[in-house]
Structure formats: C-alpha cells, structure tokens
C-alpha cells in the first residue's frame, strides 16, 4: 500500500491514502477522523483536540469526545481539566457554583479549599 | 433508561406520503444526533437518515429528495416524511440514537446505541 | 460506498462453545466497525462499537478483533440467549452501511 509519507497529513500513520489520510496510527498516537461534508480523513495525532480525550485501546488508540457535562477539554472520559465559561472545576466536574468549602479561583475558574 | 418509541406506521399506496414520529426519553435529545433505520420484510438493517444535534440532515441515495427527516427538540421528538412511497419503501422503520455524519465522536454516538421497537410501513395498491 | 459482506448467513453451534462471525469490509475503515444482536421478533441492540469497545451491559463473552477491511466478533462461551441474528456496521463514512447478517443457530 502506498503510504504517501511525503503528505503532511500521513505523519505518524502506518497505513494512509491520498483520498482519507490515515487509516492506522503507530503506537503512541491518536487516531482522530476529521470529517469535511461527506469527506473523512484520519489523522495520527500526539494530543487530542480540545473537547477531545484520548482513549487507549488494544487495536488502536483514539481520540474521544469529552462527555462530562460542561466541560471544554478532559484528561479521560471521568474526568475534566477545563470548564466551560460560567462552571468551576472541581475534582475533575464542573459546577455552576463551588462546593460548601470551596472558594472559586476567578483566574483559573477552579474550585479551591477555604472560606468564601 | 432510554426510551424510544415509534409511531405513524400503516398502509399505504405508492406515490402517497406518512410521516413517521419519534419519541425519545431518559437523555438530554437535543445533545444527540439521531438517525432512521429500515429493515424489509425478511432482510437487513438498511440506513435511512441522519440528523445532527445542530440539525444538519444525511440521507443516502436511496431515499434523497422523498424523505426528509426534521427534530424538535421541545418535544423530544424525531420524524421523518416520507413521500413518493414505492413498493421497496415497504418496511419496519426504527429510530436509533446517534450515528450523526458530520462529527467524529470516536465513541458509541458513533454507531446507533439505542434502538426503539419499530413501527411498520406498507406500501401497496 | 462501502460493502460490508458478511460471508456466513448462518452458523451452528452449541452451548459453551466458541463461535466467530466474520465481516469484511469494501475497504479500510479504520476499526470504525460496530456489531448489533437482533433477537427474534425484537429491534437492534449494539454490542460493540469502534471494532473493540463493548456497549453498557453487554457480557464480556462477546469481543470483537481486526483492523483494516477484516473484523471477527467472538462469542467465548455461547449461551442460549445468544440466539440471535448478528449484524456488522461501517461508521466510518456515509453512507453507513451493514453486513448481510448471520443467524446463530443452537444445535
């Protein structure tokens, strides 16, 4: 199979085609299938795009959509490391409010230990 | 627990027209997109439509320009209309949740997940 | 558009036994390969989705393998309610489309 490794969106692939990019990844990457209209092309990425994680899995690694409700970008599919605007993370949730306890970190919009 | 129900099934005469309903319950509809799958009497699973959370539509060749499927997500409802019946339209309809087109979700949205009970069409003179 | 060919319509097995469907994709399609059971008189249940991944509440006797164009699911230990008809679907590009089937038959 011809892997058209001179085409930048064939990096990191070990299977790839002009017309759909990448069909396999290697090892350590994240398959990621960007769709354009009725067009699909995969791509081996390091990193997940934002609102993306990425899941291990024995035939392939890929990236997967962040799930947790109200959150812009997860460390896993349990868990989230950026809050929409308006919601507090706190242990890796979002909150339209912090706990009891909780002190909101304007800067960050991270729930903190303390006082209001 | 998710829910699906079918409705608007029946006899039909080719060339006429049914509009199929949809009823979704136990998730956050307007978060998911939703999709029709048809099976003919004593054969596969065919695809019907999509629809998108945002609404973009997908139909394969089959059915374009006849069907056209539409949500309303105050009323947790998915419908498709079907015009200009054939013969070959005759089948059991199911609405399934997910399998939107337009977005890689690499997770089970990808597939269909959940499935309703179906509801019958019958297109003959 | 691609063809999903599921080479056996129908496979014997008996209870306890290890069974293997088989679905082969036009093809490559990047593990995006779900499998669906269908019961007598009942509608589609996912089983598993992106060639690997098990659906909430499916046993874990039901596994699938491949990559590429050719993906197997796997019934370790057959039961009896695994009668059923088992259908491969592409989710990789539209228009989505689905193997043929196979019923599973218990002797």
């Known amino acids: 199979r011809a892997s058209y490794v001179s085409n930048p969106i064939c990096k990191g692939c070990l299977s790839c085609s002009k017309d759909n990019g990448c069909s396999r990844c290697q090892q350590k990457l994240f398959f990621f299938l960007r769709r354009e209209g009725m067009r699909q092309y995969g791509e081996c990425l390091h990193s997940c795009p934002s609102g993306y994680y990425g899941h291990r899995a024995p035939d392939m690694n890929r990236c997967a959509r962040c799930r947790i409700e109200n959150c812009d970008s997860c460390f896993s599919k349990d868990f989230c490391t950026k809050c929409k605007v308006g919601f507090y993370l706190h242990r890796g949730r979002c909150f339209d409010e912090c706990p009891d306890g909780f002190a909101p970190l304007e800067e960050t919009m991270e729930c903190v230990e303390g006082c209001e | 627990e998710v829910q699906l129900v079918e409705s608007g099934g029946g006899l039909v005469k080719p060339g006429g027209s049914l509009r199929l309903s949809c009823a979704a319950s136990?998730?956050?509809?307007?978060?998911?997109?939703m999709s029709w799958v048809r099976q003919a009497p004593g054969k596969g699973l065919e695809w019907v439509s999509s629809i998108s959370s945002g609404g973009s539509t997908y139909y394969p060749d089959s059915v374009k320009g006849r069907f056209t499927i539409s949500r309303d997500n105050a009323k947790n409802s998915l419908y498709l209309q079907m015009n200009s019946l054939r013969a070959e339209d005759t089948a059991v309809y199911y609405c399934a949740r997910g399998g939107d087109p337009g977005v890689y979700n690499g997770d089970y949205e990808d597939a269909m997940d959940y499935w309703g009970q179906g509801t019958t069409v019958t297109v003959s003179s | 558009d691609i063809v999903m060919t599921q080479s056996h319509k129908f496979m014997s097995t008996s209870v306890g036994d290890r069974v293997s469907i088989t679905c082969k994709a036009s093809?490559?399609?990047?593990?995006?390969v779900a499998w669906y059971q269908q019961k007598p008189g009942q509608s589609p249940k996912l089983l598993i989705y992106?060639?690997?991944t098990r659906h909430t509440g499916v046993p874990d006797r039901f596994t699938n393998s491949g990559s590429g164009t050719d993906y197997t699911l796997t019934i370790s230990s057959v039961q009896a309610e695994d009668l059923a008809l088992y259908y491969c679907?592409?989710?990789?590009?539209?228009?989505?489309?689905f193997g043929g089937g196979t019923k599973l038959e218990i002797k």
């Open positions: 093809q490559d399609v990047s593990s995006a």
């Open positions: 992106w060639a690997s």
């Open positions: 679907q592409q989710h990789y590009s539209t228009p989505w489309t």
């Open positions: 136990g998730f956050t509809f307007s978060s998911y997109a």
